[in-house]
């Protein structure tokens, strides 16, 4: 059964229940509800899910039963709107319930919160977690789905099922181990880091679809899949792009049952036709469903076919370029993107899209000119600076990273970005700059041919985090401009920003720079975040401070923390030495 050739079903809920099975059905409904109502207690969601599941079973038994013919949006929306505390907990989101479908679902989607006011997840002791796992495995795993889904309202639902499967496997194995902590903690750390990365990648896909439209997403997918499957025909890539677009449109739209079902169909299709797609799929296709889909999504690029012809002949030198373009613009541009991408696994997807956009703009102009061929003859020359810009940027930043190490490289970016957009909240600047700084460890170790796709496409994901967080409470016109003008030019737009000369420095507040003994018990990461928060605040107070001035203050601050954490009376040390440090810093920075 292809992704699009479904039989008509009397009951959509029965259809999905049968396709997915009870376990996945319940998990996906829980994820959907937790992503919509992010503040609701776990128990309330479980109750709603159980009610929906019981109803689905009645429809499986008799598809003609009352309400079984209703759409999933109607059924789920009606269920969400039964929550008693909707108005008190969610305020204006309760107004969604007065609307009819499809407006009601759109309303719920618009109220998803990328930065919900929820407590940080604190990891209990290993023995406590193992006891909870053994006491009630089902509830323990549901709680995991719930906590991740409500904090990441755009998490790719079928992929979250894969994470939950790994989470369960980690506890099953490690709770029996001699040293439970040594076994479990690294696995949980890995899942946490991979989960954050997965969430951020999916958030970019949803932003691409929702803010820039299906055409933008399809262009991204053509470029990426052509790099990954360079031996596949254009029509094969086009089919995969169409199906993948449907899957992500569904997940980003809250249609999680359809999304998971269609993703399974797509994995099945890819594996059945792997000979026509890629030689790298064999291992993936031997795995169970969730692992298979994940594996396919992460599969390495296939080898490029030998002897690919030059692109210039048909896309520049031919006299038929405008004729071919006019016949079917999007197909012609799609073929250009496909042919360029399959030849350039060494380019980032966003660079490939910039080249395609430049090519399109040139044809639009030249095909209306007196001598089109003369006009577009040099179009490939326009690509050179577009290619060199990210190459040079990555070279410079990798050199800086190798010189400074990750923490100090993050600090350099913190200063750089705070000066560019000082109006952005300090927690957002710290989070985004820390993530930007991780590009060094992630990508600079790669050979030249893999650096750009690693670095620039990762930066697109991180800058999208800045864009979605900023959209919730816009404070900077420059951020809004870079985020909304062009999806593929976001990174060059931010890179081109200079110091914001219009910014009025923040008033000095000694409280911001007052530290206590609790900093000594923090993990190294948390301590870094405290110091980086102080660094952002320093730059906001003194945006014209030089690197040398900031380095001196930060070095003094590190020495102060180290000294007081070794003192017998830590709190007194922080109080007294802190005052001295603030005074010295003010003097050093001329505050």
């Amino acid at each position: 059964r292809g992704v699009f050739r479904r039989d008509a079903h009397k009951s959509e809920v029965a259809h999905r229940f049968k396709d997915l099975g009870e376990e996945n059905f319940k998990a996906l409904v829980l994820i959907a509800f937790a992503q919509y109502l992010q503040q609701c207690p776990f128990e309330d969601h479980v109750k709603l899910v159980n009610e929906v599941t019981e109803f689905a079973k009645t429809c499986v038994a008799d598809e003609s039963a009352e309400n079984c013919d209703k759409s999933l949006h109607t059924l789920f929306g009606d269920k969400l709107c039964t929550v008693a505390t909707l108005r008190e907990t969610y305020g204006e989101m309760a107004d969604c319930c007065a609307k009819q479908e499809p407006e009601r679902n759109e309303c719920f989607l618009q109220h998803k919160d990328d930065n919900p006011n929820l407590p940080r997840l604190v990891r209990p002791e290993v023995d406590v977690m193992c006891t909870a796992f053994h006491d009630n495995e089902e509830t323990f795993l549901k709680k995991y789905l719930y906590e991740i889904a409500r904090r990441h309202p755009y998490f790719y639902a079928p992929e979250l099922l894969f994470f939950a499967k790994r989470y369960k496997a980690a506890f099953t194995e490690c709770c029996q181990a001699a040293d439970k902590a040594a076994c479990l903690l690294p696995k949980l750390d890995e899942l946490r880091d991979e989960g954050k990365a997965s969430s951020a990648k999916q958030r970019l896909k949803c932003a691409s679809l929702q803010k820039f439209g299906e055409r933008a997403f399809k262009a991204w997918a053509v470029a990426r899949l052509s790099q990954r499957f360079p031996k596949a025909e254009f029509a094969e890539v086009s089919k995969l792009v169409t199906d993948l677009t449907k899957v992500h449109t569904e997940c980003c739209h809250g249609d999680l049952l359809e999304c998971a079902d269609d993703r399974a169909d797509l994995a099945k299709y890819i594996c059945e036709n792997q000979d026509s797609i890629s030689s790298k799929l064999k291992e993936c296709c031997e795995k169970p469903l969730l692992e298979k889909s994940h594996c396919i999504a992460e599969v390495e690029n296939d080898e490029m076919p030998a002897d690919l012809p030059s692109l210039a002949a048909d896309f520049v030198e031919s006299k038929d370029v405008c004729k071919n373009y006019a016949e079917a613009k999007d197909v012609f541009l799609g073929m250009f993107l496909y042919e360029y991408a399959r030849r350039h696994p060494d380019y980032s997807v966003v660079l490939l899209l910039r080249l395609a956009k430049t090519y399109e703009t040139t044809l639009e102009k030249c095909c209306a000119a007196a001598d089109p061929h003369e006009c577009y003859a040099k179009v490939f020359d326009e690509f050179k600076p577009l290619v060199e810009e990210p190459q040079n940027l990555i070279k410079q930043n990798c050199e800086l990273f190798e010189q400074l190490g990750e923490y100090k490289f993050q600090n350099a970016l913190l200063v750089r970005y705070t000066k560019k957009v000082p109006q952005v909240s300090t927690p957002t600047l710290v989070e985004v700059s820390r993530n930007l700084g991780k590009v060094g460890s992630k990508c600079c170790k790669h050979p030249e041919a893999k650096r750009m796709p690693c670095a620039e496409d990762y930066l697109s994901v991180v800058l999208n985090q800045l864009c979605v967080l900023h959209e919730k409470t816009p404070v900077s016109d420059r951020v809004t401009k870079c985020c909304t003008e062009s999806l593929v030019n976001r990174r060059p737009c931010f890179s081109a920003l200079e110091v914001d000369e219009t910014y009025v420095p923040k008033e000095f507040n000694a409280e911001t720079f007052t530290f206590h003994a609790d900093i000594c018990t923090l993990s190294e990461k948390e301590r870094q975040i405290k110091k980086q928060t102080a660094l952002v605040e320093l730059v906001k107070h003194k945006p014209k401070a030089t690197k040398e001035q900031l380095k001196a203050v930060m070095d003094d601050f590190a020495a102060f923390v180290e000294k007081c954490c070794k003192a017998d009376d830590k709190e007194t040390c922080f109080a007294e030495e802190g005052k001295k440090l603030v005074a010295a810093s003010q003097a050093a920075l001329g505050l």
Partner: nanobody, 125 residues
């Protein structure tokens, strides 16, 4: 709308060579993906090779890789198939086909919209 006419078939000994041609006329943009298919007696039609007339990319079925070469001459609206090291199992009626590059897949003849009448290739000693 689009007409395709094959030529060049015939009898050849194992190990020998043949060159098939296919002349296209009509709206040639509709033929910007072109391919060669073959059908042996009692067997299904199978894809042999395809080419995009824009971009020039080529695709081959595994059994002919390294032996057959597909090419095109856009100025003459002609498609070619150079067949070397021919084997008895290459005996079949060879068809020229064309369609849109957004649809045509070598493994699926139904994704090609236009077909020639076919030319017989017999490999026998």
């Amino acid at each position: 709308e689009v007409q395709l006419l094959e030529s060049g078939g015939g009898l050849v000994q194992p190990g020998g060579s043949l060159r098939l041609s296919c002349a296209a006329s009509g709206n040639t943009y509709l033929t910007s993906c072109m391919g060669w298919f073959r059908q042996a007696p009692g067997k299904e039609r199978e894809g042999v090779a395809s080419i995009y007339t824009v971009g020039g990319s080529t695709f081959y079925t595994n059994s002919v890789k390294g032996r057959f070469t597909i090419s095109r001459d856009n100025s003459k609206n002609t498609l070619y198939l150079q067949m070397n090291s021919l084997r008895a199992e290459d005996t079949a009626v060879y068809y020229c086909a064309a369609g849109s590059p957004a649809r045509c897949r070598l493994r699926d003849p139904t994704t090609f919209d236009y077909w020639g009448q076919g030319t017989l290739v017999t490999v026998s000693s």
